[in-house]
């Protein structure tokens, strides 16, 4: 995690970014045209709930699945969205370990699964906040 | 709009093969796997197999596996289904199905109906 | 393989009147990655291909009026029509995307008085 707590202007900036550049690794995965997505309702939030640090991503949920795909992935956004959640990584509990399926359609479903997951959340949250302020 | 193109009939003779086809469009046919179902008259839904446009990669109910084979031609968005050995036991209607991997089957075909007579 | 198992096969109600079916599986069907069950709903008219009612066991598909509600986890699930209607004249389906072979139910054939 990061060794300095970041100012809250600082995170919304990251998590901007996050927005944007996990929408662009799913349409990467899926080689796709840049389209309408379809939007996986009703799914775990990806923020914490910690007063300490609120509207922050629950980087450390996050961060072991993205570690699982990413090798599979063979993307520099990955790397990179990584990085980002790594700074946004305030808790300093022992990270779970997450193994990726053995099985080529379950890994698959695996690596979509949490692109969209990640993707679709960052985007709800974006629209929640453009109808509120 | 999303939509999976199907012929609506085929006449077979027994022991012949017949090639089904399933055409898509209205989205990225490479992101989504096609699913293939069987429906005899007045019978439920079986589940053939399924296959992934991007890589061909597939998946055979085992009952299915010696009867049917599934491909993609990527250029034109089209999957297809060879059914082999033809008996009376095929004549059915056969749909294809948009897969999605994440949640579930969203789009069928209308489906082509198969009569193997002599 | 799993095996999906629905009842009853068959049954007549009337215009308004609340209808469930259920469908059950023979292993869990709860995806542990984002905690969904791989529970999908169908509803195939007469002469018609099927059709996506429900999603996730309780999702519905847009488009899918209100009345139409999927619920269950793990291996029980249940369809439930609020207030019946003419056009809900259909076999309705369940199957698991959890696995492949992506089985089927054997159907529920509804049917107005």
């Known amino acids: 995690g990061p060794i300095y707590q970041l100012q809250p202007k600082e995170i919304q900036a990251i998590i901007v970014e996050l927005q944007n550049l996990s929408k662009k690794l799913l349409d990467d995965y899926l080689n796709k045209e840049k389209g309408v997505q379809k939007f996986d309702s009703d799914l775990p939030s990806c923020f914490t709930s910690d007063s300490q640090a609120p509207g922050n991503i629950n980087s450390s949920a996050i961060l072991p699945y993205f570690k699982a795909i990413s090798p599979s992935l063979n993307n520099d956004k990955s790397l990179y969205i990584i990085e980002q959640l790594d700074k946004l990584n305030f808790q300093n509990a022992p990270e779970t370990e997450v193994s990726m399926p053995t099985d080529n359609f379950e890994r698959k479903r695996f690596i979509l699964t949490i692109l969209r997951w990640f993707s679709n959340c960052l985007e709800h949250r974006a629209q929640h906040h453009h109808h509120h302020h | 709009q999303v939509q999976l193109q199907q012929p609506g009939a085929e006449l077979v003779r027994p022991g012949a093969s017949v090639k089904l086809s399933c055409k898509a469009s209205?989205?990225?046919?490479?992101?989504?796997?096609m699913n293939w179902a069987k429906q005899r008259p007045g019978q439920g839904l079986e589940w053939i197999g399924m296959i992934d446009p991007s890589d061909s990669e597939i998946h055979y109910n085992q009952v299915f596996k010696d009867k049917a084979t599934l491909t993609v031609d990527k250029s034109s968005s089209t999957a297809y289904m060879q059914l082999s050995s033809l008996t009376s036991e095929d004549s059915a209607v056969y749909y294809c199905?948009?897969?999605?991997?994440?949640?579930?089957?969203?789009?069928w075909g209308q489906g082509t109906t198969l009569t193997v007579s002599s | 393989d799993i095996v999906m198992s629905q009842s009853p096969s068959s049954l007549a109600v009337s215009v308004g009147e609340k209808v469930t079916m259920s469908c059950k599986s023979s292993?869990?069907?709860?995806?542990?990655?984002?905690?969904?069950?791989?529970l999908a709903w169908f509803q195939q008219k007469p002469g018609q291909s099927p059709k996506l009612l429900i999603y996730w066991a309780s999702t519905r598909e847009s488009g899918v009026p209100a009345r139409f509600t999927g619920s269950g986890s793990g291996t029980d699930f249940t369809l439930t029509i609020s207030s019946v209607k003419t056009e809900d004249l259909a076999v309705y389906y369940c199957q698991q995307g959890y696995t492949y072979p992506f089985t089927f139910g054997s159907g529920t054939k509804l049917e107005i008085k």
């Open positions: 199905a948009r897969q999605d991997i994440v949640t579930t089957v969203d789009y």
């Open positions: 209205g989205y990225t046919f490479t992101s989504y796997w």
């Open positions: 292993q869990s069907l709860l995806y542990s990655i984002n905690q969904k069950n791989h």
